[in-house]
Interface confidence: medium
């Protein structure tokens, strides 16, 4: 679990001729706000696919009214961070979509209207817990400057927020009646101690004794602004949070990317993201071939290798479009029977069945179990016009009337002895082994090579298998 954070520093007309004077034009007063959408992975998914990692809207900005004949001012922006909580692991690679919307405040039939001013899409790699990354993007005639980061929350740590740690003061096991949760590290690792005097505001460290500076700061302790003028006019997070994230003239100023490419700053250089059909350091090369990997979502590219030869993408099931960029609506074929609800999960179709029906496509009528009895606590499971019983532990056969020996399959490894038990089986492990099925060797010092024994159990103790 964690939070993706986005800070918009500025949004306004980009450099060069033809820049718009106002976001509101002749429509009357308006106010700006931003929407961020996160999708996992680096694939170019269909635009309408959901923001699977999450989405967030900013607050509405102040009302803006165009002043005739006045120079185009900085546009008033909403305050604060945009925060997108994520529930599961941070994927590391993701697509970031930032949209700038304007809300038209004049009278509208059917309520307020929003119109999209600009949309930028970046495919990025980002580890959780790292410093702020900064970017400058152009969308049409508009320029957007922003910073972003991912950070873990609650007890999560690590670059994907998947390792859980327990505060030193917390109890070391789960409460009564509870199974151990996801594996917790016994103690939270302390963050590394940075070099003495390293700026808390502008420096950080990943190894003990080092002092690495956020962009815009320099010096052995990150206390010297990289450029004394670089933060003038910066609208964004305070230097207490991020240092100076958008210094003055940078590699992307003047946009070195041709043919509508968008520019991202990298340490000491820049990177162009090119529109489809162009590639090269500055998007200066046209004529896409299969060598450029134009087919997304696992599509197979067929075509000549020379620049004059067109290519064709053969799309895998579930995708379509000239570049396999669109997801097929497989539910339109209505695969779920008996009124089931179809869900396209991407990797598979799932049918949610109405009461009384079951099966992958809701094809089975559960009435087959009517009047059928399964003995000894078994439950009836419908199966294509017949029924079968799912038996409780210790019983088997068509109607669960036969006793089954849970030890018959020799479940205890490494010479452990199996005992039948009313709720399953118990393994008594041979010396040197532990675990519910004696599967883990014990080191000579008494520490297991794999998961530790639950509290209260010593290596070699019988352990009940639940």
């Amino acid at each position: 679990a964690g939070v993706f954070e986005l800070q918009i520093h500025s949004f306004g007309p980009g450099p060069g001729p033809g820049a718009p004077r106002s976001p509101c034009s002749a429509r009357g007063p308006c106010r700006l706000f931003f929407r961020v959408c996160l999708k996992p992975g680096l694939s170019e998914e269909a635009a309408e696919s959901p923001c699977a990692l999450g989405a967030a809207l900013s607050a509405r900005g102040p009302v803006y009214t165009e002043q005739p004949e006045a120079p185009a001012p900085d546009l008033p922006l909403p305050n604060g961070l945009l925060q997108v909580p994520f529930r599961d692991a941070w994927p590391g690679t993701f697509s970031l979509i930032i949209e700038t919307w304007r809300e038209e405040l004049g009278d509208q039939i059917g309520g307020p209207a929003w119109s999209l001013l600009a949309r930028v899409t970046r495919r990025r790699r980002l580890a959780a817990g790292g410093p702020w990354a900064r970017d400058i993007q152009r969308a049409g005639a508009w320029e957007l400057r922003f910073s972003y980061r991912a950070r873990c929350e609650l007890l999560a740590v690590g670059t994907a927020c998947t390792r859980l740690c327990r505060p030193r003061s917390a109890p070391s096991r789960c409460g009564p009646g509870l199974r151990p949760c996801a594996p917790l590290e016994d103690e939270c690792e302390a963050p590394p101690v940075c070099r003495a005097g390293c700026s808390l505001e502008h420096g950080f460290c990943e190894q003990p004794g080092e002092c690495r500076c956020l962009e815009g700061w320099t010096g052995p302790l990150c206390t010297v602004p990289a450029s004394t003028s670089s933060c003038l006019g910066l609208r964004g997070p305070s230097s207490a949070t991020t240092g100076c994230l958008v210094p003055g003239p940078g590699p992307c100023d003047g946009n070195p990317c041709a043919n509508g490419g968008s520019c991202s700053e990298t340490p000491g250089s820049f990177e162009c993201t090119c529109p489809r059909g162009f590639y090269g350091l500055r998007c200066e090369v046209s004529g896409v071939t299969c060598a450029d990997g134009p087919c997304f979502n696992g599509g197979l590219c067929v075509g000549g290798a020379d620049p004059d030869s067109a290519y064709i993408c053969h799309c895998p099931p579930g995708f379509q479009g000239s570049n396999c960029e669109k997801r097929v609506d497989r539910c339109s074929l209505q695969p779920c029977r008996n009124g089931g609800l179809c869900l396209d999960l991407g990797h598979a179709l799932r049918c949610r069945c109405r009461a009384g029906f079951a099966g992958p496509r809701c094809e089975h009528n559960l009435d087959d179990c009517a009047g059928r009895a399964c003995a000894n606590g078994g439950t009836c499971v419908e199966g294509g016009g017949a029924h079968r019983c799912s038996c409780a532990l210790g019983f088997g056969g068509r109607d669960c009337r036969e006793r089954a020996d849970p030890c018959a399959a020799r479940p205890c490894a490494h010479g452990g002895r199996c005992y039948a038990h009313f709720s399953g089986l118990v393994c008594a492990c041979a010396p040197g082994y532990m675990g519910s099925r004696c599967e883990f060797p014990v080191h000579p010092d008494g520490v297991s090579a794999l998961p530790a024994a639950p509290p209260g159990l010593r290596p070699g103790d019988p352990q009940r298998y639940l």
Partner: nanobody, 129 residues
């Protein structure tokens, strides 16, 4: 998927009050907006009130401004519609919806159904004179 379950509908005399609730479950972090729409037989579904569940900005149809209040409890993933000074013309099936601006469009109306991908089953509100 996002699942929405409405409650709180019923019958009331004109001038009375009702409070509708809508509980959301599932991938609620994928949606930006939740709201209430209503529909009477033979007519199109119309927006009543919507709320940006992130920062709390609200939108109301002109016909309910000053009488209805939409609110949300993010911790419970629930939105509410407090309906006061009810009129017979408020009689309708009220639907809870969740969604937001699509990532493939350039225009959106917070009080119109397009863009709301997830809908509840509806709860009936009847106001008698």
């Amino acid at each position: 998927q996002v699942h929405l379950v409405e409650s709180g509908g019923g019958s009331v005399q004109a001038g009375g009050s009702l409070r509708l609730s809508c509980a959301a479950s599932g991938y609620t972090y994928r949606v930006n907006f939740m709201g209430w729409f209503r529909q009477t037989p033979g007519k199109e579904r119309e927006g009543v009130a919507t709320i940006d569940s992130g920062v709390g900005t609200t939108y109301y149809a002109d016909s309910v401004k000053g009488r209805f209040t939409i609110s949300h409890n993010n911790a419970k993933n629930t939105i509410y519609l407090q309906m006061n000074s009810l009129k017979p013309e408020d009689t309708a099936m009220y639907y809870c919806a969740a969604g937001g601006p699509p990532t493939d469009g350039d225009r959106w109306y917070p009080l119109r159904p397009p863009g709301y991908n997830y809908w509840g089953q509806g709860t009936q509100v009847t106001v008698s004179s």
